[in-house]
């Protein structure tokens, strides 16, 4: 058992059927000694007296608030959560599988730039009794800091009978130094409560790796004099890391026809313009990526050949 | 480039990109290992990285881009060592068109650019990481790869923005 | 598909040598690493030695004066010599695939050939 | 050399629960974290069969009902349901260092 807050205590249980479960001994947070009874939950049932109650803890019925009172005074709670291990490893009940970049990928997180600065998200059925707490640092034995807000309802979808949600949580490296090259990871964990049900996940990851430019801005074409072809220029987003001598980024420039079928035409330029023949009823879409880092390339960022 | 001159910067431009762009076509080449949730030991301890106080950022190449380039030579020749370590050339065996060839020779390229033959910078002893089996030489030019990405990368940076802002 | 067959089965007196060849299909030689794994009748399993790719080879050192590992890719074959022979080599021998990706597991393995060792 | 210490030497389980075998290292089979530690199934007449590789990876084929997890010296396969298929003799294998040695073995067996 470890303390996860103030009056809150999060049970580890071997989860199997006909488990012995743990011994747990909650202690009354008062100077009193005599006179204290055990209740849990809304229940008016007496579990027990005096300053200490044992309890076997076994399942979810055995969570719960606990608290002790005196002649009708409550003197404190103990707030007790479970946390399941099934075959060795920690359930993840609450949050759904992205299966994205690979399997058992809870957590997924992005930046747009090298500031220190990055969103993660998670996905959950679950729409009530939920809470969220998330922490991070670069680095675990000699952590260093990594300022977190809270987690927030970003986004709600219909998926065939069910409804999903998603959760974003934004972070800020204390002292980030964008032109370094990261040695240790950025570790986030996040600690989720459904009812009694406590879990942890936990991602870790380097900045460099979790990259995704803003798609190009202020995208233009100019038609050249008697010819099909058009010059094609576009700027760096606002959102990318500066200067851009030093912090490049690399553009694919793409003509693509009305019909998905159709043969993509495709530039790779490391300059903010290129030119490319515009056909009829085609579109000119250009991305970026990180001119020195394989990371990920941005959306497109589109416009109509007409 | 010893004692205060100014490196080439187009040249190593140049070349520092051509090596980001081997070291990524390299890396899935030298023998996949599916390591995703593997390694709770950092592997790169050992090798040097560009770090905050080595003056690498813009406003340190503007002060004095020296510190910069030395802590970039030694990092050089630490993989540039690495790379022709039984690490690389060892069981098993790179196929003879494999662009780590390449990359080793461009290491040693762009080292050649920063410090001209008879200037000497003091550089990092390579750690003995002394696989004894292939699949960990695999496991180790897996990582290797991973992190010499991560240290072109930044030394691309340096030279585009010198070549940029610091050519004569 | 992946194959790997053993010659045999063998019956060796005592002192006298043992050949096996392991002839393998489905994949080259040339990327992956073969390696001879013996089991005694009802006991457990014992590594005795291992090819590689390039050709090189390892032996388990309590063997190794005795064994002998080599392999012709062009015939997609692999050979066990072992000398000196006695009562306790008497064994099911199998010729394994090792794959490096997989960090050197035997991820495919031969029916095996029994090798008995009796005068 | 490397000894792998395989327990129990027997189990028995019943159709539906859960088998644990253990497997504990002489010394660590790490190696720049990763472990090179595998699994083995052989049931009765066969030749082995890879089930688990590098500690936790299942190998291709194999149903989800197998796991392993550890590191270093301790590690686990873990059968869960167990069915009366998985009636065999179970090993281990580190090949971290030559000679790559193998586990005594565990004989599962159904209640």
């Known amino acids: 058992i470890w303390e996860l807050k103030k009056d809150v205590y999060v049970v580890e249980l071997d989860w199997y059927p006909d488990a012995p479960g743990e011994m747990v001994v909650l202690t009354c947070d008062t100077p009193e000694e005599d006179g204290i009874t055990w209740t849990l939950d809304q229940s008016s049932e007496v579990l027990g007296s005096g300053k200490t109650l044992t309890i076997q803890v076994k399942e979810f019925g055995d969570a719960g608030q606990y608290t002790c009172h005196k002649g009708g005074e409550v003197l404190s709670h103990s707030l007790l959560l479970l946390h399941k291990k099934e075959d060795g490893i920690w359930s993840t009940d609450i949050l759904k599988d992205q299966k994205e970049p690979k399997n058992k990928t809870f957590l997924r997180c992005e930046a747009k730039n090298y500031s220190g600065r990055f969103t993660c998200w998670w996905l959950t059925t679950i729409s009530t009794d939920l809470t969220f707490s998330v922490k991070s640092s670069r680095g675990s034995s000699d952590p260093q800091g990594v300022t977190c807000g809270a987690a927030t309802l970003s986004a709600e979808r219909v998926r065939g009978d069910n409804k999903e949600y998603e959760y974003s949580v934004e972070c800020q490296e204390d002292s980030a130094c964008p032109a370094a090259e990261e040695s240790l990871p950025i570790e986030v964990m996040v600690d989720a409560v459904h009812k009694l049900k406590y879990e942890n996940y936990t991602s870790s990851f380097f900045i460099r790796d979790i990259i995704k430019p803003d798609p190009p801005k202020n995208l233009q074409l100019k038609p050249l004099k008697n010819s099909r072809q058009v010059e094609v220029s576009w700027e760096y987003p606002d959102t990318w890391s500066t200067p851009h001598s030093y912090f490049s980024l690399t553009f694919c420039v793409q003509v693509q026809g009305k019909s998905k079928r159709e043969k993509k035409d495709r530039v790779f330029t490391d300059k903010t313009s290129a030119t490319v023949i515009c056909r009829k009823n085609a579109s000119i879409s250009v991305r970026a990526q990180d001119r020195y880092y394989s990371s990920s390339w941005s959306e497109w960022a589109s416009v109509p050949c007409s | 480039v010893p004692g205060g001159s100014s490196p080439a910067w187009t040249q190593c431009q140049q070349l520092s990109q051509k090596l980001c762009t081997l070291a990524w076509s390299a890396h899935p080449l030298v023998g996949h290992m599916d390591l995703r949730e593997e390694g709770d030991e950092e592997t790169t301890n050992d090798v040097p990285h560009i770090q905050c106080g080595d003056g690498c950022d813009p406003q340190g190449l503007r002060d004095n881009s020296q510190f910069c380039l030395q802590r970039i030579h030694q990092g050089l020749i630490f993989y540039e060592k690495l790379l022709g370590s039984d690490i690389f050339t060892g069981e098993p065996s790179l196929l003879p068109d494999s662009p780590v060839g390449q990359l080793h020779a461009s290491l040693l390229g762009l080292s050649q650019l920063l410090q001209p033959e008879g200037h000497h910078w003091e550089t990092q002893q390579i750690p003995s990481l002394s696989p004894s089996q292939p699949w960990q030489r695999l496991l180790l030019r897996f990582k290797i790869l991973r992190s010499l990405q991560a240290f072109v990368a930044v030394a691309a940076r340096v030279f585009a923005h010198g070549a940029a802002t610091l050519s004569p | 598909q992946v194959q790997l067959k053993e010659s045999g089965p063998v019956l060796v007196a005592p002192s006298q040598s043992l050949s096996i060849t392991c002839t393998v299909s489905g994949f080259s030689l040339n990327n992956f690493a073969i390696s001879w794994v013996r089991q005694p009748p009802g006991k457990g399993l014992e590594w005795l030695g291992a090819i590689w790719t390039g050709g090189g080879t390892n032996y388990n050192s309590a063997l190794k004066s005795r064994l002998s590992i080599s392999k012709d890719n062009s015939k997609s074959q692999v050979f066990l010599k072992m000398n000196s022979l006695q009562t306790d080599d008497t064994a099911r021998y199998y010729c394994?695939?090792?794959?490096?990706?997989?960090?050197?597991?035997?991820?495919?393995w031969g029916q095996g050939t029994s090798v008995t060792v009796s005068s | 050399d490397i000894a792998l210490t395989q327990s129990p030497a027997s189990l028995a389980v019943s159709l539906g629960q859960r088998a644990t075998i253990s497997c504990r290292a002489s010394?660590?089979?790490?190696?720049?974290?990763?472990?090179?530690m595998h699994w083995y199934q052989q049931k009765p007449g066969q030749s082995p069969k890879l089930l688990i590789y590098?500690?936790?990876n299942l190998e291709s084929g194999i149903p989800a009902r197998f796991s392993g997890s550890g590191s270093r010296t301790d590690f686990t396969l873990t059968i869960n349901p167990v069915e009366a298929d998985d009636v065999a003799t179970y090993y281990c294998?580190?090949?971290?260092?030559?000679?790559?040695?193998f586990g005594g073995g565990t004989k599962l067996e159904i209640k």
């Open positions: 010394e660590t089979i790490n190696f720049y974290g990763t472990s090179f």
């Open positions: 394994v695939r090792k794959d490096y990706s997989y960090g050197g597991a035997m991820d495919y």
């Open positions: 294998q580190q090949t971290n260092e030559d000679p790559y040695t």
């Open positions: 590098r500690a936790s």
